[in-house]
């Protein structure tokens, strides 16, 4: 079974700063901001059947996600 891509929570680089829950690390400004500011993928409501936008990101191939890591995004530590 495929896991979703990891979020900015990488284990192979030191975390410059921890993010509290509901915050995400913004790579461009290099600090934690409210996840709602980052155009994070929004879960579809149950039963939603409309097709996804043509080029929206989808959790599909693994990007080295560790066992048990959820699909993007994961608030918290980088």
């Amino acid at each position: 079974m495929r896991r979703g891509p990891r979020s900015l929570r990488g284990r192979d680089a030191p975390a410059p700063t921890p993010c509290v829950p509901a915050e995400c690390f913004d790579l461009l400004v290099r600090h934690c901001v409210a996840c709602g500011l980052l155009r994070t993928p929004r879960p579809k409501p149950a039963g939603a059947s409309s097709p996804a936008p043509r080029t929206a990101l989808q959790p599909q191939e693994s990007v080295g996600a560790g066992a048990g890591e959820a699909a993007l995004p994961l608030p918290g530590l980088l």
Epitope: P5, A13, C24, D26, L27, V33, L37, R39, V63
Partner: antibody, heavy 118, light 111 residues
């Protein structure tokens, strides 16, 4: 679904200022990063810059002295101004937005051709 | 700026053949365990379309014949069996740091 639509004059005279607007629907420009990219005829893609959720901007150093990106949150639009244009600024201009956390530009406008000519 | 070099500039192939496109970065585009390399397809008169993000992840609606691989500075886009609609220009793009940069493109043309 997020949609982006560029608008503005298709013809600009040399030395004048190119002005384009990107109208966004399906998401708020107070979330995410909102970019401008251009493509010279028959050439590759060149990154111009962004305006962020907070209103902060970044401009490609190669164009920085001539570029201004601003926004109107009440209209959910953001704009590009490029001053002192020459024929070398003739290009298709795209607005685009990346998703988090990979910053891959998954939403694009259809592009608008701007020709600089007298 | 991170410079991306794509090769070959042109690839002449027939439908059904395998296409292998290369992108080399002037420095690593890896950060925090992620490869910030994306691939786009562009057809004449159209905006670029995101195919692959974070080196190996297909965007929504992208067929399984498209795959990406690589890390650090060397990346590959593979089209396992070319369909007629796949003949286009392909660009790699790094999103590790601004200014975000694009490769010069590889044109996949019908042989």
């Amino acid at each position: 679904e997020v949609q982006l639509q560029e608008s503005g004059p298709g013809l600009v005279k040399p030395s004048q200022t190119l002005s384009l607007t990107c109208t966004v629907s399906g998401d708020s420009i107070t979330s995410g990063y909102w970019n401008w990219i251009r493509q010279h005829p028959g050439k590759g893609l060149e990154y111009i810059g962004y305006i962020s959720y907070s209103g902060s901007t970044y401009y490609n150093p190669s164009l920085k002295s001539r570029v201004t990106i601003s926004r109107d949150t009440s209209k959910n639009q953001y704009s590009l101004k490029l001053s002192s244009v020459t024929a070398a600024d003739t290009a298709v201009y795209y607005c685009a937005s990346p998703n988090y956390p990979f910053y891959a530009m998954d939403y694009w406008g259809q592009g608008t051709l701007v020709t600089v000519s007298s | 700026d991170i410079v991306l070099t794509q090769s070959p500039a042109t690839l002449s192939l027939s439908p059904g053949e395998r296409a292998t496109l290369s992108c080399r970065a002037s420095e690593s585009v890896d950060n925090y365990g992620i490869s910030f390399m994306n691939w786009f397809q562009q057809k004449p008169g159209q905006a670029p379309r995101l195919l692959i993000y974070a080196a190996s992840n297909r965007a929504t609606g992208i067929p399984a014949r498209f795959s990406g691989s690589g890390s650090g500075t060397d990346f590959t886009l593979t089209i396992s069996s070319l369909e007629p609609e796949d003949f286009a220009v392909y660009y790699c793009q790094q999103s590790k740091e601004v200014p975000w940069t694009f490769g010069g493109g590889t044109k996949v043309e019908i042989k």
